[in-house]
Every structure is written in C-alpha cells, then in structure tokens.
C-alpha cells in the first residue's frame, strides 16, 4: 500500500519529506515566502494530502503562486509610480506614492514607498498598510509676489495667481425683507475651509445681536481675479458658518470666523491655501511689512457715506493689493483714543498703515488676509484679517487699519476644522 513518490511544487515544499509513504501517511504542502498554495483556483497557506488504502494520494499536489497585492489604492491628490518593470504588483514589487506638487505635500515627509508583502498587502515602513496623506501646500503662490512696492487705497492691480488664497464671499440674505446683499473677503486655509472676519458673516440686523447668516445665503468664489468675469473661478456654497463665540459687535473684539465649503475645492495655480501662524500672543512685530488684497474701495476720495449709499458701484473690478507696515500697538491705541466714539484697540487686534495715510484697506476688503512672508519657512502666513477702521474716509492721515490678530486664534481655528495641530504640520509657520 505504498503511494507514489511526491515532487514538491515549484517555490514550495512538502513535509515531512520521506523516501516512501504508506497508507495513512499525511503530508503538508506549503509555499516559500511570497507564494501561496493554489488549489482549484483557491488560495490557501497550506494544503494537506493523505496516502489512501489503495496506494493513491487523496489529492493532486497543488501549485505555488506568487502573492499579488493587486492594484494599489488611489491616493487623493496623489500619484502612483511603479518601480518594477511592467507595473508588476507581485511579491517584493515596489510602488511610490507622491503628491500632486506643488499644490500638495506628503504628511510627515513620508517616502511614499510601499512594497508588496508576503501577506499580499502594500506595506510602508512607517505607515504600515495605511495610505499616506497629501496635505495642501500653503503660503507658496505659483507666481512669486513682486518686490514689495513702497507705497484697496493706494494699491495696485494683482496679477492672477499672486494671492491664490484670496476668496470673495458673497452673502445674499434672502430671509430678510427686503433681501440684503453684501460681500467681503476671506482666505483659503485648506481645500475645505475659509478664514474670514466674523462681521462679514453676521446677519445685518437692526439690533446688536450676533447671529450668523444662514449657510444657504453664502457663496464663496476662489481663483477669482476680475469680479466681472467669474467664469474661471471656482464657486462653492457653504456647509457651515462658524462665528467666534465671543465676537463683540460693539468693539469688534474676536472678529474671526470660518466657512466650511460644501465640497473640497481642487487646488491649482490660482487656488492655494495660506499658512496659519504659530500660536503667539505678540502677533506680528511692529514695522513688519505685510500685504493685503481685496476688491474693496480703491478710490481714496470716496467717503464712507458715499460707499454705503452707492452699494457695490464703487468696488474694484480687479483684485487690488497694498503693502502696509505693522504699527506699534501703543501708537495705534493712542491714535484711536484721541477720536470721538468707542474705538478700543484690544490685544486681539493689531494695526497697519502709514501715518501720512494714502494707503489702506477699506469697506469691502473686510475679512481679507494680511499676509507676512516668513523667511524661515519661505511661506506666506496670515497674521491678520481686515476688521475695522476709523470714522474718516479710508486712507486718511493717522487713521490706521485694524486687523484681527490671527495668532491668538490658531487653536480655535484648528479645533473648528477638526484637525489636531500635529496632523497639519505643513500648515504651521516654522
């Protein structure tokens, strides 16, 4: 009752290995690392056969098939390149994930290299079987900003792509009778979130109650250059409108808000986020130069009353920008304390502008980002949001523009966006 001699499969072995097999002897067929036992088109780790009473084996010897990790999972905002010829996906094959540069960067500077493991899964040394994450790059416009002009009031036209984080926020409050329409600016922080001033998104009520406008009434335009031609821009509706819970209409303290977009926007040369600063109560240092862009008033001779009465007729068609120095806090406080009216400059604000006037942000620029270039990280960082100004017309002598100090709100912003700061390292100024 001896069974025929057994030949182990290619890339496999049989155990125990004996010269002769008799009735009731059993053998276990297994494969080398990176191969699987294949029997009747079913993959398994091992296969057992037995020598029968009539001197035959209970089954044919199975084959060993190389493990196949199959097509790797797609990476959002990423690409896959095959290191192995013929785009092989079998054991020990290698692939490399990369992000769509220059708009996305891999989290934690991961290599992106994955190897097909013996278990049939793509494995990375650090992330294991998890896919890498492509985060939006921030603060790096595709078109480099010009050497800052010495001297939006006193501003100049922005070339497309200079301020890829710039958002136009249009609010059409159809719940009001009659309907109410206004606009402001904002700054893209990620593919889904816009940073702006709370007063832009507060319902324009007849009392001082702070109530956000309904999300249905908010439209955000990104990649926009000329407001007369919105065809090339990305427009998005809002999924959420979040005002800072302590926003105070009486002194505009905590004038900061976020809009979550209904769908993430595709990033590109004209749509890229700006970086958030480090959490630092001091904010930007006095005399540092920053840039602000907006579609607000660009005529220095227009008074506030004329602006209000003429609706949107005094807007700039093309995005304007201006370069302004940060003003020492004490100097700004003094300049406002000398005016009639309640003009308190709090520690959550900073001022920017020139003593002699002529260059300023104005109505309609509200919520736009005051950005400063960080030499260390070589990125543009949003240090301020256009908040308020004096009673005189924009660009008046010794009337500085007042900005929300974004560095005081970094934790609040991350919290609202639902991202721990460690996960978004590239977004933080280094």
């Amino acid at each position: 009752n001896e069974c025929p001699e057994l030949q182990p499969p290619v890339h496999g072995k049989i155990e125990p290995s004996q010269a002769k097999y008799f009735f009731k002897d059993q053998v276990l067929v297994s494969c080398d690392t990176g191969y699987k036992v294949l029997k009747d088109n079913v993959e398994m780790d091992t296969f057992q056969i037995e020598c029968l009473k009539d001197g035959t084996w209970s089954n044919k010897i199975p084959t060993c098939k190389i493990v196949d990790c199959r097509a790797p999972g797609e990476l959002e905002h990423g690409l896959i390149t095959f290191s192995t010829r013929n785009n092989l996906t079998t054991y020990k094959s290698e692939i490399k994930y990369s992000c769509q540069e220059p708009y996305y960067k891999m989290l934690n500077n991961n290599t992106g290299i994955y190897t097909c493991s013996a278990q049939g899964v793509w494995m990375n040394k650090v992330l294991g079987r998890s896919l890498p994450t492509c985060l939006p790059e921030c603060g790096q416009p595709s078109r480099s900003l010009p050497s800052l002009v010495k001297r939006i009031i006193g501003g100049r036209n922005a070339e497309p792509g200079l301020f890829p984080w710039q958002a136009l926020i249009v609010v059409e409050d159809t719940s009001r009778v009659p309907n109410d329409k206004w606009f402001g600016s904002g700054a893209l922080l990620s593919a889904s979130w816009i940073l702006t001033a709370a007063h832009v998104l507060r319902s324009q009520r007849r009392d001082t109650t702070v109530i956000p406008v309904s999300k249905e009434h908010v439209t955000v335009y990104l990649g926009l250059h000329d407001v007369r031609d919105k065809s090339g821009a990305v427009n998005s509706s809002a999924a959420r409108v979040v005002l800072h819970p302590d926003f105070n209409i009486q002194n505009y303290n905590h004038d900061i808000a976020l809009v979550q977009l209904q769908e993430p926007v595709p990033l590109g040369p004209h749509v890229m986020p700006v970086c958030l600063p480090r959490l630092e109560p001091e904010g930007p240092a006095p005399h540092m130069l920053g840039l602000v862009a907006g579609w607000g008033i660009s005529n220095p001779n227009v008074t506030v009353d004329e602006i209000i009465s003429s609706g949107t007729r005094t807007l700039s068609d093309v995005l304007q920008y201006v370069k302004l120095p940060v003003v020492p806090h004490a100097e700004c406080k003094t300049s406002y304390e000398s005016r009639s009216g309640n003009y308190s400059v709090t520690e959550n604000m900073f001022c920017a502008g020139y003593y002699e006037g002529g260059k300023d942000t104005c109505l309609g620029d509200s919520g736009g980002a005051f950005v400063i270039f960080d030499d260390l990280s070589q990125r543009w960082v949003v240090q301020g949001l256009v908040s308020w100004g004096g009673p005189e017309e924009c660009g008046s002598k010794q009337v500085y523009g007042v900005y929300t100090k974004v560095s005081n709100y970094v934790d609040w912003v991350w919290e609202q966006m639902g991202l721990p700061q460690s996960v978004v390292e590239p977004q933080v100024e280094r």
Partner: antibody, heavy 114, light 112 residues
C-alpha cells in the same frame, strides 16, 4: 405675503397660566426672531422677550423672566408665550412681531379677572 | 438698563404743518464699528398694532412715506414729519436696540 396671526382673546382667573400663540407665514420662520411686546390699556409698549427659532436662543427683559416663557414649534412655524401666576397687572394686549419688527400680529387681549 | 425719554408727550398740529419729536437715550446708541445708531421709530394708530417707520435712526422701512425722516446720533434723536396728514394721527414710539430693547414713553400726535 408675510403674516403673523395671533390666538384669540383670553379671560383667565388670577393665579392661573395662559399660553398665547403667534403663527407665522410668508417668510423663513427659522431665520428670523420673534419678539413679544406688552401694552396695558392706555399705556405704552413694553418689550417682554425674544426667541430665535433656528437655535432656540431666548432673551428676556429681566422684569419678565419669571412671568413669561417663550417657545417655538418650528414644524408649524408657530411661536408661543406662556404667562404664569397671572394678576390684574398682566391684563393687557400682547403683540408678537417678526422679521425684526417689520411685521406685527394683530394682538391678543388677556383679561385677568375672578 | 438704557432709559428712553420722549418729548413732548403730546402735541397738536394742523394738517400740512411740519412736526418734530424728540427721543433721548441714557447712553450712546452709536456703534462706531458698524457706523450705525441702534434706534427705531414706530407709529401706532388707535386700535392698531405698532408699525415700524425708521430703523438705524435714519433708514426708512420700505413702504413708509418719505415725509417721515429720522435723524440724530449718539443719545439725541428726532423724528420729523415734513407735512402732517390726517392719517398720521397716532402715538409715536422710539426704541433702542443697542442692548436688548427699551421703548420710550411715546409722543401722541393729534391733528387740530
């Protein structure tokens, strides 16, 4: 068109409670607050309180915090005001207003008498 | 609490005359940031519900005749009716909305 329709007159006994209603139509109920105002016979207007249907937030005139309770039923676009522990001082016409006072109800006369 | 004081408490004028009535608040109703005064004017005709005429001190509610004008800033406000009509017989109230809401005592306008 926008309308605020208030419930009919009420004759109630001292110490009792009464619940007045204000049904809104013709506008976005949840996006606009409802105010309640009291006017005693031959007297001026007195603000009682405010309710915002979208999130249910409420503000009261301190004088009325123990006297009035404001609620809304968003499904029927109706605002309610319940007045407690009624006395003759509560005999008045009560108005509701909406869309920041652009529209007013016709008023509900509450008479407190034994 | 903000106290609103209206004067005079009543006045009688002939049709076609110009009339002004005053409203003073115990504190400023101007918010410099919004450049708005949070004061409204209402008209209440006999046996009717109040009607909003003016908000933000000087903005006329839609449908209100242009003979009604609101002016003033800070603590002193005025409602002017440029040419009084018989149908303007009413009590006029001012109301602050700077901090919650407070109505003034009212000015009763009678037609001679």
């Amino acid at each position: 068109q926008v309308q605020l329709k208030q419930s009919g007159p009420e004759l109630v006994k001292p110490g009792a409670s009464v619940k007045l209603s204000c049904k809104a139509s013709g506008y976005t109920f949840t996006s606009n607050d409802i105010n309640w105002v009291k006017q005693r016979p031959g007297q001026g207007l007195e603000w009682i309180g405010w309710i915002y249907p979208r999130d249910g937030s409420i503000k009261y005139n301190e004088k009325f915090t123990d006297k009035a309770t404001l609620t809304v039923d968003v499904s029927s676009s109706t605002a309610y005001m319940e007045l407690h522990s009624l006395t003759s001082e509560d005999s008045a016409v009560y108005f509701c207003s909406g869309v920041e006072d652009s529209y007013w109800g016709q008023g509900t006369l509450v008479t407190v008498s034994s | 609490d903000i106290v609103m004081t209206q004067s005079p408490s009543s006045l009688a004028v002939s049709a076609g005359e110009r009339v002004t009535m005053s409203c003073k608040s115990s504190q400023s109703l101007l918010i410099s940031r919004t450049r708005k005064n949070y004061l409204s004017w209402y008209q209440q005709k006999p046996g009717q519900s109040p009607k909003l005429l003016i908000y933000w001190a000087s903005t006329r509610e839609s449908g209100v005749p242009d003979r009604f004008t609101g002016s003033g800033s800070g603590t002193d406000f005025t409602l002017t009716i440029s040419s009084v009509q018989a149908e303007d017989l009413a009590v006029y109230y001012c109301k602050q909305s700077y901090n919650l809401y407070t109505f003034g005592g009212g000015t009763k306008l009678e037609i001679k």
